[in-house]
């Protein structure tokens, strides 16, 4: 079908109809003259069209080959661990949207950098394996031009709240250690919660092709909606959580939560907020500190842990973090034991007490008096939102919120011994906390951010998009390397695949025209006999 329409556009269908038309009434010489003239005209016309098309497409595209590849490295120094990401992109296309992709992720062995405050001399060794991996992955000739960025998030924000001097010491040693590698080290810093939210939003929309003004023949990007409406971003870490999206109406209610971007020639008014202490790990510490206040003795019967689960917690560890300061009290014991009772409903109720919804100085709030405009559009939920829900097998678009709740009830009530057997390969420290984390995610999304059973279907749990992890790191690098232009860049009019297709097509047309010409004008007279 497509081939028929292509034939007709370049005039070959005419040739076919002329050659196959009845010519019994015509003399041999008349036919020959008639065919020769028409075929000559058609062949000449087709050749000229094909040559012009080849030149036009070739000149307007003007692609420089071979491609010069660039690399970039971003280290995400989170509260629970550090991950190193390596990105690559074609140098000639660095202002295009969607050309940067992740080639490697390396998870650094050990806790987050904030835990090295008392052993800073170990930071260099801690980072070695992943930095050496980067050395291997990136061609040696590119090392000196490859920028390296380290962004520290909520774990370091919390350390800085406790002691600016200690946070500076950690960052200083991190910078010294990273500067010893042959890359173009661009520094280590604590990014703000607002930056973390904004860069996460940029990352997912960049990867989903939401900033692209080009129309595609087909889409290979998952979750892609018909229009260019951006996705909201939901990020959950160990120590903070971020919500970022473009609200329906531009809001000036809370300027602290408003960001203005101009990306690829379009203006975006974005709402963002980072809730420090509401990452899954710090939320658990908060919940334990709150619950131990009302415990009658050093036994804490906890519905957020599986029945039969037991763990001893040091009170000093509990009150170590600034996140539990509001619940701190003098306890008559130095340790207490968590005893799991595995009840989702009770766990959910306990978690809800972390969200103060009684006070709101705005038209609408999330919790703790923080402004939140009405939710709008689809949301990508990534990082721990994805890791936890993926473990629980609840990331499918088909699973309703009611079904998720049912599954959580079932999961939390399973005995600890049973859980350990079912998930033998998972570290017990992580395994024991999935009931809490899953419950916390549901509570945060439903009661914290006011998603409903209906709007739940607009949440897409995303791990990777086209091979790149969803998270703030890609957006951070794109910004720092000036790869997101404010204006739509002047780019080649066609995608590379379309360009190649057209070049091949017009070349084939030329070849076909040439072959037909040769067949007609270099065949003996029996060729014409057969035609008549």
């Amino acid at each position: 079908m497509l081939f028929d329409s292509i034939l007709s556009t370049v005039g070959l269908s005419k040739l076919v109809s002329v050659v196959s038309s009845p010519a019994a009434a015509l003399s041999k010489s008349n036919v020959k003259t008639f065919c020769s003239k028409n075929i000559l005209a058609i062949l000449g016309f087709s050749s000229i069209i094909a040559v012009i098309a080849l030149l036009a497409v070739g000149l307007t595209q003007n692609k420089a080959l071979p491609e010069n590849i660039k690399y970039g490295i971003v280290l995400d120094a989170g509260s629970s661990h550090t991950s190193l990401y390596i990105y690559k992109w074609p140098a000639e296309k660095e202002n295009d949207t969607g050309v940067v992709h992740q080639v490697e992720e390396c998870r650094v062995k050990g806790p987050g950098i904030s835990k090295y405050v008392q052993k800073v001399n170990e930071i260099g060794i801690y980072l070695t394996d992943c930095m050496e991996r980067a050395r291997e992955v990136i061609p040696r000739s590119q090392h000196q031009e490859t920028p390296v960025y380290l962004g520290a998030t909520a774990g370091m924000r919390l350390l800085r709240m406790e002691s600016e001097e200690l946070a500076d010491r950690v960052l200083d040693v991190v910078e010294r250690s990273l500067s010893n590698y042959p890359f173009d080290f661009q520094g280590a810093r604590i990014i703000t919660g607002q930056e973390e939210g904004a860069y996460g939003w940029i990352t997912i929309n960049y990867l989903l092709g939401k900033f692209s003004q080009k129309t595609r023949w087909f889409s290979i990007v998952p979750y892609e909606t018909n229009n260019q409406e951006t996705f909201g971003a939901l990020d959950l870490g160990g120590a903070s959580t971020q919500i970022t999206f473009v609200p329906q109406n531009q809001t000036t209610e809370s300027p602290d939560n408003a960001l203005q971007f101009r990306l690829y020639g379009k203006d975006y008014n974005v709402y963002t907020h980072s809730f420090l202490c509401y990452g899954k790990d710090q939320a658990l510490w908060q919940k334990l500190a709150k619950d131990i206040q009302v415990a009658s003795n050093e036994i804490l019967r906890d519905p957020c842990f599986h029945p039969g689960y037991k763990k001893v917690v040091n009170v000093s560890d509990l009150y170590k973090t600034p996140c539990t300061k509001r619940f701190e009290m003098t306890l008559p014991f130095q340790q207490f034991e968590i005893q799991g009772i595995g009840n989702y409903q009770q766990c959910h109720q306990s978690v809800l007490e972390l969200f103060n919804t009684s006070y709101c100085p705005y038209s609408q709030c999330a919790f703790n008096g923080i402004f939140l405009p009405p939710l709008q559009g689809d949301f990508g939920a990534f990082s721990a939102f994805y890791f936890v829900m993926n473990f629980l097998n609840l990331t499918s678009e088909k699973v309703s919120q009611e079904k998720v709740t049912e599954m959580m009830k079932k999961f939390c009530s399973q005995p600890w011994e049973e859980i350990k057997t079912s998930y033998a390969g998972v570290k017990e420290k992580y395994l024991s906390e999935y009931c809490f984390s899953g419950t916390y995610i549901l509570s945060l999304l439903l009661q914290g951010y006011h998603f409903t059973a209906d709007s739940w279907e607009h949440i897409h749990f995303i791990g990777k998009i086209q091979g790149s992890d969803a998270g703030w790191t890609l957006g951070y690098m794109l910004n720092l390397t000036n790869m997101i232009p404010a204006e739509q860049p002047l780019s080649t009019p066609l995608s590379h695949s379309t360009y190649v297709f057209l070049m091949v097509l017009f070349s084939l047309v030329l070849v076909i025209v040439a072959i037909i010409g040769l067949l007609i004008f270099h065949k003996p007279s029996y060729f014409w006999k057969d035609m008549v």
């Epitope: 001399n121 200083d172 250690s177 500067s179 080290f185």
Partner: antibody, heavy 121, light 107 residues
């Protein structure tokens, strides 16, 4: 007020090594970094590397990576800079200098008197 | 690495006159910039840090300004002891880098 006192001038053969010392008097290193900066005759200042004596953490300029080793002995408040595989271009005055702060505060507020190292066959 | 460029290489000024020295960074260094003075046969001496803060014991005639990539050291009224070589240095990122220096000489 801390003063940095460096070891005396050295004359070395090409291919050999030199080790320059820098002792803090009137105070200790503490957690301050010690940087090493060199200056070839009639030329500008060139940073070579740095160490935090308290932790023994050193970092170096790429140009000197593999050829320079900076160490420190906290007990004697002394820092050392060893440069190997010496060549004539390494003829310079070598200074140690104290960094005034930690993270991104590496202004050099106290300098040693300098050590002249001559590399000649 | 961040490249620091100083201009002019040599500045001829009469005593009592004002001297303006420039320093440019190849990328933004915020205000993480220091100025040093070096006299022949001596070690450098810190004059200005944080782009505009005078170090202890530095006379008020020395002032620094600028942020990002463009910086200026101004000596309001040159004294005989001010004739020396002046270096700028960024300390935002490793490696620490110095400008090539500006020699202030007597006109």
């Amino acid at each position: 007020q801390v003063q940095l006192v460096q070891s005396g001038a050295e004359v070395k053969k090409p291919g050999s090594s030199v080790k320059v010392s820098c002792k803090a008097s009137g105070g200790t290193f503490g957690s301050y970094g010690i940087s090493w900066v060199r200056q070839a005759p009639g030329q500008g200042l060139e940073w070579m590397g740095s160490i935090i004596p308290e932790f023994g953490i050193a970092n170096y300029a790429q140009k000197f990576q593999g050829r320079v080793t900076i160490t420190a002995d906290e007990s004697t408040s002394t820092a050392y800079m060893e440069l190997s595989s010496l060549r004539s271009e390494d003829t310079a005055v070598y200074y140690c200098a104290r960094e005034s702060g930690t993270y991104r505060d590496h202004r050099l507020d106290v300098w040693g008197q300098g050590t002249m190292v001559t590399v000649s066959s | 690495e961040i490249v620091m460029t100083q201009s002019p290489a040599t500045l001829s000024v009469s005593p009592g006159e004002r001297a303006t020295l420039s320093c440019r960074a190849s990328q933004s260094v915020g205000s993480n910039l220091a100025w040093y003075q070096q006299k022949p046969g001596q070690a450098p001496r810190l004059l200005i840090y944080g782009a505009s803060t005078r170090a202890t014991g530095i006379p008020a005639r020395f002032s620094g300004s600028g942020s990002g990539t463009e910086f200026t050291l101004t000596i309001s009224s040159l004294q005989s002891e001010d004739f020396a070589v002046y270096y700028c240095q960024q300390y935002l990122l490793w490696p620490l880098t110095f400008g090539g220096g500006t020699k202030v000489e007597i006109k």
